[in-house]
């Protein structure tokens, strides 16, 4: 998977009036890394691992960062038009990536009210706008802002496209991010499904990077994927992630199936318990 | 490539005991199963268990509960199967084979001829 | 046990035939089958699983079909190294089972 930075802003506004302040929260290779602390105005790190990152370094240049951007989209806020009575929001995500070839991507996506009406591929400088026509009329609207403002020239793009690549190979220097190596905990339960039939579930949490290999073997070999369920791998709010999987199988059969889990080049293989939850830390 | 290298020939008395090993080269060992399957001369083939190399889990074939014992040693990726109690009826070349993870038996060793004879 | 029955216990073939070899379980086993050639030296090969899934590295010629019960095994076009036992295996229940095998000879 690439290594990316995500940036994740949101102003508001209230019966046509722009508010102060805005929110903000920056991921680093999918996990939550910094936000923004409206309270102090300061870019905070999102857990430990985050402020080992940057080690004792501050985080000025973040805050920084943060703050200009969200004096941006609130002036783009206040140029959109059409804003009823209520409140509004204006959100800008902001993704650059790098990819194992060196090579870079980078987007930038507007949504109002939760809704996606406009979208940037900084590299192609291509512009795209969904087929509605309230996205139409709001992707036009700040489209002729951008225009007028000329900070928002190709340039100005390019830069935060630069400044966004920048930071990431920043933190990417760290050892922290590079050579993180979490294994996951494993745990297989089992619950009653219906008649002569048990749902084994397997669960990996706490682990990083991403990438994991988590499936039912009957007698040594994989289920096919029809028979089995997946939950999506998600962070888990420690810098870490967890995902599942899941399939029914008779009761008796139990001795017959293990999870098999991969990750980051290290392997092991989980037992059904015989009644129990049954937890097992992974040891390399 | 994946092999599966099994100890030579054994000529046993009745009553004794014997120990066939299967050495894996070509993969990582403790990824996949290693099964054992019994042919006496001449017959079919038979299921005799299997082990897990990763944390030592066996599953045997009831006829064959007693008769035959499962281990691995992870160090030099080699699994063995003890027969013990020997009769002419354990007379029969013993096969030991792995899996893809995709597939049963996938890889088979060259089996190892067992005689139990007075 | 499930028991496996290929009823034929040899077969006559001649170089560039369509062979047919059958296996009958004791009850459906879902797919749940594997075939498996060996050679007059005891080289044992895995050819098809789940019932019709050809092993990488395995010629074409040699295909799988059934359901429930009943399954075969077919050779398209007979080549001289085709010459073997070839046994079926269940592996929907335990203890997983072999067919008795059908020794393919040359006519």
């Known amino acids: 998977e690439p290594h990316s930075l995500r940036y994740n802003l949101t102003v508001l506004s209230w019966d046509g009036s722009v508010q102060s302040g805005f929110l903000a929260e920056v991921h680093l290779d999918g996990q939550p890394f910094l936000r923004y602390d409206r309270q102090k105005c300061r870019a905070k790190p999102q857990g430990q691992w985050a402020e080992d990152v940057l080690g004792n370094k501050t985080w000025d240049r973040e805050t920084r960062d943060l703050t200009g951007n969200g004096k941006d989209l609130r002036m783009t806020l206040a140029h959109i038009k059409d804003q009823k009575e209520g409140l509004h929001s204006l959100q800008e995500i902001r993704v650059c990536e790098i990819h194992e070839d060196n090579s870079t991507r980078s987007s930038q996506h507007f949504y109002y009210d939760g809704e996606l009406f406009l979208s940037q591929n900084v590299e192609t400088e291509e512009w795209t706008v969904p087929q509605s026509s309230r996205a139409q009329t709001l992707a036009m609207n700040v489209r002729n802002f951008l225009k007028e403002d000329a900070m928002k020239t190709k340039t100005h793009y390019h830069a935060m496209h630069a400044d966004c690549l920048q930071e990431l190979r920043r933190y990417l220097e760290s050892s922290v991010v590079l050579r993180r190596r979490v294994p996951p905990m494993v745990n297989v339960t089992r619950s009653e499904a219906s008649e002569g039939n048990i749902t084994v579930t397997c669960r990996a949490s706490s682990f990083y990077p991403r990438n994991i290999t988590l499936t039912w073997r009957q007698d040594g070999v994989s289920l096919s994927h029809d028979t089995q369920q997946w939950g999506d791998v998600l962070p888990d709010g420690n810098g870490t992630y967890q995902t599942w999987v899941a399939t029914r199988i008779c009761q008796g059969e139990e001795q017959r199936f293990t999870c098999y889990m991969e990750h980051s080049g290290n392997h092991s293989t989980h037992p059904v318990p015989s009644g129990k939850v049954l937890v097992l830390q992974s040891h390399w | 490539q994946v092999q599966l290298q099994q100890s030579g020939p054994e000529l046993v008395k009745p009553g004794a005991s014997v120990k066939v090993s299967c050495k894996a080269s070509?993969?990582?060992?403790?990824?996949?199963?290693i099964y054992w399957v019994k042919q006496s001369h001449g017959k079919s083939l038979e299921w005799i268990g299997y082990?897990?190399?990763?944390?030592?889990?066996?599953v045997y074939n009831q006829k064959f509960k007693g008769k035959a014992t499962l281990t691995v040693d992870k160090s030099s990726s080699t699994a063995y199967m003890h027969l013990n109690s020997l009769t002419s009826e354990d007379s029969a070349v013993y096969y030991c084979?792995?899996?893809?993870?995709?597939?049963?038996?996938?890889?088979w060793g060259q089996g190892t001829l067992v005689t139990v004879s007075a | 046990d499930i028991q496996m029955t290929q009823t034929t216990s040899s077969l006559s073939a001649s170089l560039g035939d369509r062979v047919t070899i059958t296996c009958s379980a004791g009850?459906?086993?879902?797919?749940?089958l594997n075939w498996y050639q060996q050679k007059p030296d005891g080289t044992v090969k895995l050819l098809i699983f789940?019932?019709?899934s050809l092993q990488s590295g395995v010629p074409s010629r040699f295909s799988g079909s059934g359901s429930g019960a009943d399954y075969s095994l077919t050779i398209s076009n007979l080549e001289p190294e085709d010459i073997a036992t070839y046994y079926c295996?269940?592996?929907?229940?335990?203890?997983?089972?072999f067919g008795a095998g059908t020794k393919l000879e040359l006519k």
């Open positions: 084979a792995t899996t893809d993870g995709y597939s049963l038996f996938t890889y």
């Open positions: 070509g993969y990582a060992f403790t990824k996949y199963n």
């Open positions: 082990i897990d190399p990763y944390n030592g889990g066996t």
């Open positions: 009850q459906g086993i879902n797919n749940y």
């Open positions: 789940y019932t019709s």
């Open positions: 295996q269940q592996y929907s229940k335990l203890p997983l089972t």
